[in-house]
Amino acid sequence: KKEDGESTAPTARPKVLRCKCHHHCPEDSVNNICSTDGYCFTMIEEDDSGTPVVTSGCLGLEGSDFQCRDTPIPHQRRSIECCTERNECNKDLHPTLPPLKDRDFVDGPIHHKHHHHHHHHH
């Protein structure tokens, strides 16, 4: 019989990581903190009017490698950074929007205006 308080070694299980969440808080978050078996992230992207919006939260382990790789998306300026080294590590992540490419100004009048307006503000 095992002594009380003594057990066999724990099997490897994901250890919950707490992350700050903003604009991306799941239904189980409390006080803008979410829980994940994966990564914390902070992302910056432009909204429809060209205004930069910062979002932060939790990414599940499944598929997070791909999401954290920050693959460029045509006609969309966004950047994401991920971390796991400590709880709420994404408080210290400050991704910046990728620079405007020349072709962003010659993709048509609406797109041109959209990016030029944003560029003017920075």
Partner: antibody
């Protein structure tokens, strides 16, 4: 094998403070959250809070904020809970327990705290 | 805070009988992101510390006899002991591990006739 060793009993006077210990062995101390749970006779279980030994990040039950302070010493793989301004309401069994995902995989044997003059 | 309500508070059974006990939560414990229910069950024998039986509502902890069966979803959960044994005399607690603060039910005391 996993062991969470706690002293069997502590006797403390009202108004004083006490620091309860929980010495962990048999696993990597920083790989699990350490929780503390209170049990009064016939009153079920109450979660006090938890601490991640890897970065000393803590969460507290609002009810125990100002009453309990959780710390760890990673060199000795020991977790501590300090309870302050003790009253008879703090007399209880206090368990340490470890978790990966907020359910308690392993529990210590508990420390019976008696607050009495 | 999520309130956990267990019933009955106690029950007396004979060896070999089927036992069911209930645990209800004040809000859903089902996470839409992974379709898991964040509920655990513990057994506490007299004079001992609690022992994990089931987590994520229905996943039996390794080494726990298969007569212990966790079921349910959302807000309503059940722990079933398919054929109760003398050594099952204990208090049984449910706990939500959905969010902080973690909360427990008041327990169900299983006594033997």
């Amino acid at each position: 094998q996993v062991q969470l060793q706690q002293p069997g009993a502590e006797l403390v006077k009202p108004g004083a403070s006490v620091k309860l210990s929980c010495k962990a062995s048999g696993y990597t101390f920083t790989s699990y959250w350490m929780h503390w749970v209170k049990q009064r006779p016939g009153q079920g279980l109450e979660w006090i809070g938890d601490i991640d030994p890897s970065d000393r990040y803590t969460n507290y039950n609002q009810k125990f904020k100002g009453k309990a302070t959780l710390t760890v010493d990673t060199t000795s793989s020991t977790a501590y809970m300090q309870l302050s301004s003790l009253t008879s309401e703090d007399s209880a069994v206090y368990y340490c327990a470890i978790s990966g995902w907020d359910y308690f995989d392993y529990w210590g044997q508990g420390t019976t705290l008696t607050v009495s003059s | 805070d999520i309130v956990m309500t267990q019933s009955p508070s106690s029950l007396a059974m004979s060896v070999g009988q089927k036992v069911t006990m209930s645990c209800k939560s004040s809000q859903s414990l089902l996470k839409s992101s992974n379709q898991k229910n964040y509920l655990a069950w513990y057994q506490q024998k007299p004079g001992q510390s609690p022992k994990l039986l089931v987590y994520f509502a229905s996943t039996r902890e390794s080494g726990v006899p298969d007569r212990f069966i966790g079921s349910g979803s959302g807000t309503d959960f059940t722990l079933t002991i398919s054929s109760v044994q003398a050594e099952d005399l204990a208090d049984y607690f449910c706990q939500q591990h959905y969010n902080i603060p973690l909360t427990f039910g008041a327990g169900t005391k299983l006594e033997l006739k």
